[in-house]
């Protein structure tokens, strides 16, 4: 079987994907311009350097991360430096018209370009659950509907919930999660016999999806703490973060061999354990007053996520058609509620000691901010799965799924697989 | 001791264009978000504007959006309010302040704790 | 919205003082209370609802209950007689009660 790309493909990405970029460029051109405003240069180089930390978290951790897969690692890394290129364009865009376009053009900054990386990083926490079973040219669909879906739905809940940029940028893990598996439940879901090995994780992918782990490990307190707006709300997010992390580490490790039989350690529960901290410390990681509480929420968290990872495959698998290695969906579905549970309880707790009159109105807020994120996560998952599933695209064939020759040119080989 | 001093004020027309400074001293000014806010004669407060610590990102009142930029050097501990397209309700007197952050329980707290003595803007033909 | 009442209040030295803010919405306790004299620098006196700005004295209390919050001078001493504004940071655009004018009757 030839390995080429579908004809009907090689005319419809690069047209489909060029025409798109040119429209971004002429959006540019028209309505962004930069800050023009002085500013001290040192302080310049470390807001930047905020910046460069989520592109590493986004480029090399999410892209290594989800490169486990025996035959589709180089299109996992790729097609993820891809969406985020081109997410990021649009959510500097969009983020611009939905919040200052009235005031004329839409004025480009350091923290526009922050918002936009973490944005465009929902995208790849989503795609985890259908990478292998679309095209780049489906790709580009899911990052269009995505990022203006998380735009539409941060600039909503910023407007009626009065919510600042990290509490309402912290929905993303609840949004991608459910965008995710939306998208997935949508998509052709058996693999054809013959097939089924080609979901397998490998060594050397899974090695590289080790380090993916680990870049996302190192550089989760940069995500957590970036759109915090003082130095000690960085500096508390950043501390606890750590702590979450490190303890999630831990018990990743060991409630990975005491869930196994023969004591194993499983690299998929390993892989997206070592996260769990991260991800459940989020919302309310500027908050947490003493490092112990951020370390009880990591053991906490690593242990829902390798109970997740032991349980929940075989019903993804079955339901959503998601392989057992990608199980950044439901993982951050179930950390990103947990996390969002701690906030209202915070929540509660404050209330309290304002006047007991308004604590109901405020869990209320609170749940309908969240239900508010998961129905437009779970409604805009599903159109994009309506789309993906359009002719037009040229979708893989079931038979091709998870197969970097679909997509790749490889010297060394004369014919397809 | 800790110290702002606004300076910059003055006479302008409308629609002409004015930058009041404020100068900190006695902190480490690149640790504090700071803040316009301004006074009209016979009126109350009006917050006008703030600006981060790092200077990443930047928040108006409705009334000067889109005609005033506030932009920091920290290396030289300035804080600078650019005002465009002046009206003459924007006759006041401006003061600066520093932010600080405290850590409630579901939010953290910014308040104004320190304030400058003002400088006068009067827009006028 | 920030409702404050009254607009002008008149009071003699060691009288008690109170003056209410008003939140249109629900703020929790993020509302700050400053003090301002004709000339002078704006003055903080209380921040998150009810915590004393350290060197204010403790005449000055906050409190809050629900929306409600109020400012409340034990003792009126002459220094006091002045402007009071509330202020809320729940969220941005930050905003002002619009002043509480104390005078000396």
């Known amino acids: 079987m030839s390995s080429k790309y579908p004809r009907s493909v090689r005319r419809c990405l690069p047209l489909w994907a060029l025409t798109l970029e040119a429209a971004l460029i002429l959006l540019f051109y028209f309505f962004t311009h930069y800050d023009a405003s002085l500013e001290d240069q040192k302080g310049l180089v470390a807001s930047y350097q905020v910046g460069q930390d989520l592109t590493v978290m986004a480029a090399i951790g999410l892209g290594f991360l989800t490169s486990s897969f025996r035959r589709h690692s180089w299109s996992s890394v790729a097609f993820n430096l891809f969406m985020l290129a081109l997410g990021v364009q649009w959510a500097i865009l969009l983020d611009g018209f939905l919040s200052q376009f009235p005031s004329g053009k839409v004025v480009i900054t350091l923290f526009s370009i922050r918002l936009a990386t973490m944005s465009a990083l929902s995208v790849l926490i989503s795609v985890d659950a259908v990478l292998g079973k679309v095209n780049l040219a489906q790709l580009v669909v899911m990052v269009l509907v995505e990022v203006t879906a998380l735009g539409n739905l941060r600039m909503v809940i910023s407007n009626i919930f009065n919510t600042d940029y990290h509490m309402n940028m912290m929905h993303i893990y609840v949004f991608a999660a459910y965008f995710g598996l939306s998208v997935a439940w949508c998509l052709p879901k058996p693999l054809p016999e013959g097939t089924e090995d080609k979901d397998q994780t490998a060594t050397i992918p899974s090695l590289s999806a080790m380090l993916g782990a680990l870049f996302l490990w190192m550089f989760w307190p940069s995500f957590n703490s970036a759109l915090l707006r003082s130095p000690i709300e960085r500096k508390n997010a950043v501390f606890n973060t750590y702590y979450a992390v490190a303890v999630s580490v831990v018990t990743a490790i060991s409630g990975s061999s005491l869930a196994h039989p023969q004591g194993k350690i499983s690299k998929t529960y390993v892989h997206s354990a070592v996260l769990a901290g991260g991800v459940a410390v989020g919302t309310s990681c500027h908050l947490i007053p003493s490092p112990w509480l951020a370390m009880v929420l990591g053991l906490v968290a690593g242990l829902i996520s390798v109970g997740g990872a032991k349980y929940l495959p075989g019903c993804c698998n079955r339901v959503l058609g998601i392989p057992h290695s990608s199980i950044m969906g439901y993982n951050f579905s179930l950390l990103g509620l947990l996390g969002e549970i701690i906030y209202i309880v915070l929540l509660v707790l404050d209330t309290v000691g304002a006047g007991n009159g308004m604590i109901g109105f405020q869990v209320l807020l609170s749940i309908g901010e969240l239900s508010l994120a998961i129905v437009i996560a779970l409604m805009s998952g599903l159109l994009t799965g309506l789309l993906l599933n359009l002719k037009i695209w040229k979708a893989p064939h079931e038979a091709k799924y998870f197969d970097d020759q679909v997509f790749w040119k490889f010297p060394h080989l004369a014919v397809g697989f | 001791q800790v110290k702002l001093l606004e300076s910059g004020g003055g006479v302008v027309q409308p629609g002409g264009s004015l930058r009041v400074a404020c100068v900190a001293s006695?902190?480490?000014?690149?640790?504090?978000?700071m803040h316009w806010v301004r006074q009209a004669p016979g009126k109350g407060l009006e917050w006008v504007a703030f600006?981060?610590?790092?200077?990443?990102?930047?928040g108006y009142g409705d009334s000067v959006k889109g005609r005033f930029t506030v932009s920091r050097d920290n290396s030289k501990n300035t804080l600078y309010l650019q005002m465009n397209g002046l009206r003459a309700e924007d006759t006041a007197v401006y003061y600066c302040?520093?932010?600080?952050?405290?850590?409630?329980?579901?939010?953290?707290?910014?308040?104004?704790?320190?304030w400058g003595k003002g400088t006068t803007v009067t827009v006028s033909s | 919205v920030m409702t404050q009442s009254p607009s002008s209040l008149s009071a003699s030295v060691g009288d008690r003082v109170t003056i209410t803010c008003r939140a249109s919405q629900s703020i929790i306790r993020y509302l700050n209370w400053y003090q301002h004299k004709p000339g002078k620098a704006p003055k903080l006196l209380i921040h998150t609802a009810s915590s004393l700005q350290s060197g204010v004295p403790s005449r000055f209390s906050g409190s809050v209950s629900g929306t409600d919050f109020t400012l409340t001078i034990s003792s009126l001493q002459p220094e006091d007689f002045a402007t009071y504004y509330c202020?809320?940071?729940?969220?941005?655009?930050?905003?002002f009660g619009q002043g509480t004018k104390l005078q000396i009757k």
């Open positions: 600006i981060w610590f790092d200077a990443s990102n930047k």
């Open positions: 202020q809320q940071s729940y969220t941005t655009p930050y905003t």
């Open positions: 006695g902190f480490t000014f690149r640790n504090f978000g």
């Open positions: 302040a520093r932010e600080k952050a405290v850590r409630g329980i579901s939010r953290y707290n910014y308040y104004m704790d320190v």
